[in-house]
């Protein structure tokens, strides 16, 4: 899986979208999890409604919401009141039994509020960008991460 970078601004909301094949994942609940450490598990943050037919209903866990357009094939996660500690590597998952398929790997970056910037010429607008082409970077971030190996945060 490539990793997609989503950049948001501290104090604001960030919407993360995870497209998927609606037929292939028909009837499956979805989840949003956070990668704990370089080789740690992906810890569940929030999942869609227990009844798949009600997946369109927004479910919250703290400041994170999830909703699933099962016909259009788009899972949407909203991170409200984004803070620096929300930065991290996440996954959108499709659940089947005790297994989880990764729909998308997402790197969330939290930037300082651009309204604080003194030099408007330096402003640039956060959003979504596909992971970079550099094969080494891709490999270093997209390799298989095994559960339970290194607790977060990793030690040197």
């Amino acid at each position: 899986h490539n990793t997609t970078v989503f950049q948001g601004v501290a104090g604001q909301s960030l919407q993360v979208s995870c497209p998927y094949d609606s037929m292939k994942h028909w009837g499956r609940r979805k989840a949003w999890c956070r990668q704990l450490g370089e080789k740690g598990p992906c810890q569940r943050v929030v999942s869609t409604h227990n009844l798949w037919l009600l997946s369109f209903l927004r479910r919250w866990n703290g400041s994170t919401a999830i909703t699933d357009d099962t016909l259009g094939g788009t899972l949407t996660i909203t991170l409200r009141n984004l803070q620096p500690h929300d930065a991290g590597l996440y996954q959108c998952q499709s659940l089947h039994g005790s297994e989880a398929d990764t729909l998308r790997k997402v790197l969330v970056e939290v930037l300082a509020d651009p309204l604080d910037h003194r030099d408007a010429g330096d402003l640039w607008f956060p959003g979504e960008s596909e992971s970079f082409e550099d094969a080494h970077v891709e490999h270093s971030i997209s390799r298989s991460l095994l559960e339970g190996e290194i607790p977060f945060p990793p030690t040197s």
């Epitope: 970078v5 370089e38 620096p84 590597l89 970056e109 939290v110 945060p153 990793p154």
Partner: antibody, heavy 121, light 107 residues
Framework: QVQLVQSGAEVKKPGASVKVSCKAS????????IHWVRQAPGQGLEWMGW????????TSAQKFQGRVTMTRDTSTSSAYMELSRLRSDDTAVYYC??????????????WGQGTLVTVSS | DIQMTQSPSSLSASVGDRVTITCRAS??????LAWYQQKPGKAPKSLIY???SLQSGVPSRFSGSGSGTDFTLTISSLQPEDFATYYC?????????FGQGTKVDIK
């Protein structure tokens, strides 16, 4: 072991720019943010900002907006901090430091040895 | 910006003493607090993250506690190599800010 090695001391004139390098080794460079912190002579620590070596994304403290540019070169596992329009009060030791969190912001764990930048006419 | 206030600014202690340094944030920062040790002419060394978790390789005589606005760094039995300046830092809100430092010297 994880190590950050910085470039040597610099002497600059007011109005000039300085570029400090920070070469990482012993870990996956693109997996951990690099912070820049400075310390004026006899003073405390001041956070300047960070760069995410994976994406190249940066954020800096308002005080340095428009003057600081943070970049990285993944091929050499190096991060760079350039400060422009130098003033005498920019005289300080500049440190790079690795964040402890994997692609996250979790406080720093390893620091470079520091680079003394002296601004004097 | 969040102001981090350390107290005392300096203290004199003897080897074997129990030393406590406090750090107060001007607003709540949960447990997003780190502690650092710095010796003259050297780079800071990370001691504690997440208010109370010890960094790898740091002696167990160092401990941290607190949450919200009030935090404490404790050295249970001061050793000769512990004479240094200690800084707290919050990483809850931009810009990340440090306390002004607490210098621990020999009595």
């Amino acid at each position: 072991q994880v190590q950050l090695v910085q470039s040597g001391a610099e002497v600059k004139k007011p109005g000039a720019s300085v570029k400090v390098s920070c070469k990482a080794s012993g870990y996956t460079f693109t997996g951990y943010y690099i912070h820049w912190v400075r310390q004026a002579p006899g003073q405390g620590l001041e956070w300047m900002g960070w760069i995410n070596p994976y994406s190249g994304g940066t954020t800096s403290a308002q005080k340095f907006q428009g003057r600081v540019t943070m970049t990285r070169d993944t091929s050499t596992s190096s991060a760079y901090m350039e400060l422009s329009r130098l003033r005498s009060d920019d005289t300080a030791v500049y440190y790079c430091a690795r964040d402890a969190g994997y692609l996250a912001l979790y406080g720093t764990d390893v620091w470079g040895q520091g680079t003394l930048v002296t601004v004097s006419s | 910006d969040i102001q981090m206030t350390q107290s005392p600014s300096s203290l004199s202690a003897s080897v074997g003493d129990r030393v406590t340094i406090t750090c107060r944030a001007s607003q709540g920062i949960s447990n997003y607090l780190a502690w650092y040790q710095q010796k003259p002419g050297k780079a800071p060394k990370s001691l504690i993250y997440a208010a109370s978790s010890l960094q790898s390789g740091v002696p167990s005589r160092f401990s941290g506690s607190g949450s919200g606005t009030d935090f404490t760094l404790t050295i249970s039995s001061l050793q000769p190599e512990d004479f240094a300046t200690y800084y707290c830092q919050q990483y809850s809100t931009y810009p990340f800010t440090f306390g002004q430092g607490t210098k621990v010297d020999i009595k």
